[in-house]
């Protein structure tokens, strides 16, 4: 909501919900950085060191099985995402510790920010994906044993990209840089032009295409994976199935404060009382919603040490028997032993 | 040479409006800098009272936010205060004046002459 | 609001005499950058406020050098090496660090 209606309460920089209300002061206090400011700058210190190590080596350990492991394609791309992201923190840090200050120009103001977003984009369709492919898996097994191919991975994660993007430009678009005078400071933010209906529906559109509707068809689909699954109890690979499902979980647990504070900051007046307890706590919601950009390599670590039973292999071992485990399809009973063997040899990971 | 001009009524009613023109010349107001409203009250009392930027982003003093507008006309080079539900503690000189600079090094360089208001019924 | 104390409220002086104007301030106005907003402006009778400091310490174009600023966090102060006819007025400091924005009250410079 940054966007400038030329009036600012405590703006919280760079995330896209604000709406800039210039005629409210930006700093009441001078020198002292707010409590939500405060906690996150921690949680983007954490983010980014665990983010970029942890992201980084999951790139690494998948970039080498994504020719032959279609698992591997979309654990790659998801931490790719996640990477990116990552590389916009010190950034965004910096704005922070400079009260919400942005010297670093209005490329980098229109660029930076939108990584969140493109982020979240990028995962959520990724994700999607990732959610057919199990669900073709367990309810299409037939199919995948004939089309289910890294080519077609590969297409599939150009396709969530490409998509991502342009979702991603409206934001793009409409972040500008402006300039303060008591304190002299430039700000980043998004500039609606004084158009509540387009702030709005924005928002509205990140809500929906965000974070409600990927939410009600994944909850769909892993009801119905779940329920096969749990049914025949005749799947090898509930590994990734269960390692997906905590993604895809944690994906919505930490979108959730941004989502609802950027829908109501959009449908409230940037005076009112609530708006601006909202924009106080704006970068915090910011940085909470940034722990998606971590939390991947510690679902990788956690599940890994769960199916070990404890920590006997090296990171990237561990991570390579994650992330890169082979799917055996043995859904239907009619299917005969030269069927699945077949299947073991053609299908590829999920 | 940057020079400023205020104009408007000299009286005006309680509860009335006061709406005051700030004439720039020698620089566009959309080039560059904060363009501001100050009044000094009878006692020699300064106060700022907001300004609209280049951009055309507006600042207001909280004690006035509730009554303050500035506006401006990019085609005339001007500048507008408008300053409702006025009262006689609204009596003073209302000044325009430009602030900016080299970032960081902002102040008031150019000033206004300034134009009298006195509110009385 | 940031509270702005300058003393004193009149100063008479002898010409050629130095002078010494202060500014205090319930906070400190040393922005979270470093910098310190504190500008000192005169004003002559019948006049507009004309800038002499800005960032406590920088004379503005123009301004002759017997006009010094100096001080830190919440102490600031102006000082005139050696007072002639034409200094003579009100002098303002302004604090542009906090918002709003806020000017002293104010210090007349008269003849003795």
């Known amino acids: 909501m940054d966007s400038f209606n030329y009036t600012t309460p405590d703006y919280g920089h760079y995330d896209d919900k604000d709406t800039l209300d210039l005629n409210t002061p930006v700093d009441k206090t001078s020198n002292t950085l707010r409590v939500p400011d405060i906690l996150a700058l921690v949680i983007f210190a954490v983010v980014f060191l665990v983010g970029v190590l942890g992201n980084a080596l999951v790139v690494w350990v998948t970039a080498f099985e994504a020719k032959r492991t279609i698992n591997a394609i979309w654990f790659l791309n998801l931490a790719v995402a996640d990477f990116l992201s990552c590389l916009a923190l010190p950034i965004l840090f910096t704005s922070i510790v400079q009260h919400h200050h942005w010297p670093f120009g209005g490329a980098a103001c229109s660029i930076l920010p939108s990584l969140i977003l493109l982020n979240m984009y990028a995962s959520i369709l990724l994700l999607a994906t990732i959610s057919a492919d199990r669900f073709l898996l367990v309810f299409k097994p037939i199919w995948c044993q004939n089309f289910r191919g890294a080519g077609l991975a590969w297409i599939a994660c150009a396709v969530a990209w490409g998509l991502a993007l342009l979702l991603t430009i409206p934001s793009f678009l409409y972040r500008v840089v402006r300039e303060e005078y008591f304190p002299p400071k430039v700000l980043c933010g998004v500039d609606y032009s004084h158009d509540k209906r387009r702030e709005r529906a924005v928002a509205i559109v990140r809500l929906v295409l965000g974070f409600l509707w990927p939410l009600l068809t994944l909850t769909i689909c892993y009801t119905f994976i779940l329920l096969r699954t749990w049914s025949r109890r005749a799947t090898r690979s509930t590994k990734t199935l269960k390692v997906v499902v905590a993604v895809v979980a944690s994906f919505f647990i930490f979108w959730l404060p941004y989502q609802v504070t950027g829908i109501m900051m959009s449908f409230l007046e940037p005076s009112s009382p609530t708006f601006l307890l909202l924009k106080k706590l704006d970068s915090l919601c910011v940085s909470f919603a940034y722990i998606n950009c971590c939390i991947n390599p510690i679902i990788y670590v956690v599940a890994g040490q769960g199916f070990q039973g404890r920590l006997r292999k090296s990171l990237p071992s561990l991570l390579r028997n994650v992330l890169t485990e082979e799917s055996v399809v043995r859904e239907s009973k009619s299917f005969t032993r030269s069927t699945v063997d077949t299947m073991a040899q053609k299908t590829q990971a999920v | 040479d940057v020079q400023l001009q205020e104009s408007g009524p000299g009286l005006v009613k309680p509860s009335q409006s006061l709406s005051l023109t700030c004439t720039v010349t020698?620089?566009?107001?959309?080039?560059?800098?904060?363009w501001n409203w100050i009044r000094q009250f009878p006692g020699n009392k300064l106060e700022w009272m907001g300004y609209i930027s280049y951009s055309g982003s507006t600042s207001y003093n909280p004690s006035l936010k509730s009554r303050i507008s500035i506006t401006r006309d990019t085609s005339k080079n001007q500048f507008f205060l408008q300053l409702s539900s006025v009262t006689t503690e609204d009596t003073a000189t209302y000044y325009c004046a430009r602030y900016g600079g080299n970032y960081p090094t902002y102040a008031m360089d150019y000033w206004g002459q300034g134009t009298s208001v006195t509110v009385s019924s | 609001d940031v509270v702005m104390t300058q003393t004193p409220l009149s100063l008479p002086v002898s010409l050629g005499d130095q002078a010494s104007i202060s500014c205090r301030f319930s906070q400190s106005i040393v922005y979270s950058n470093g910098n310190t907003y504190l500008q000192w402006y005169l004003q002559k009778p019948g006049q507009s406020p004309k800038l002499l400091i800005y960032?406590?310490?920088n004379r503005f174009s123009g301004v002759p050098d017997r006009f010094s600023g100096s001080g830190s966090g919440t102490d600031f102060t102006l000082k005139i090496s050696r007072v002639e006819a034409e200094d003579l007025g009100v002098y303002y400091c302004?604090?542009?660090?906090?918002?709003?924005?806020?000017f002293g009250g104010g210090t007349k410079l008269e003849i003795k």
């Open positions: 302004f604090q542009g660090s906090h918002v709003p924005p806020t």
């Open positions: 020698g620089y566009s107001i959309t080039s560059d800098y904060a």
């Open positions: 960032k406590v310490s």
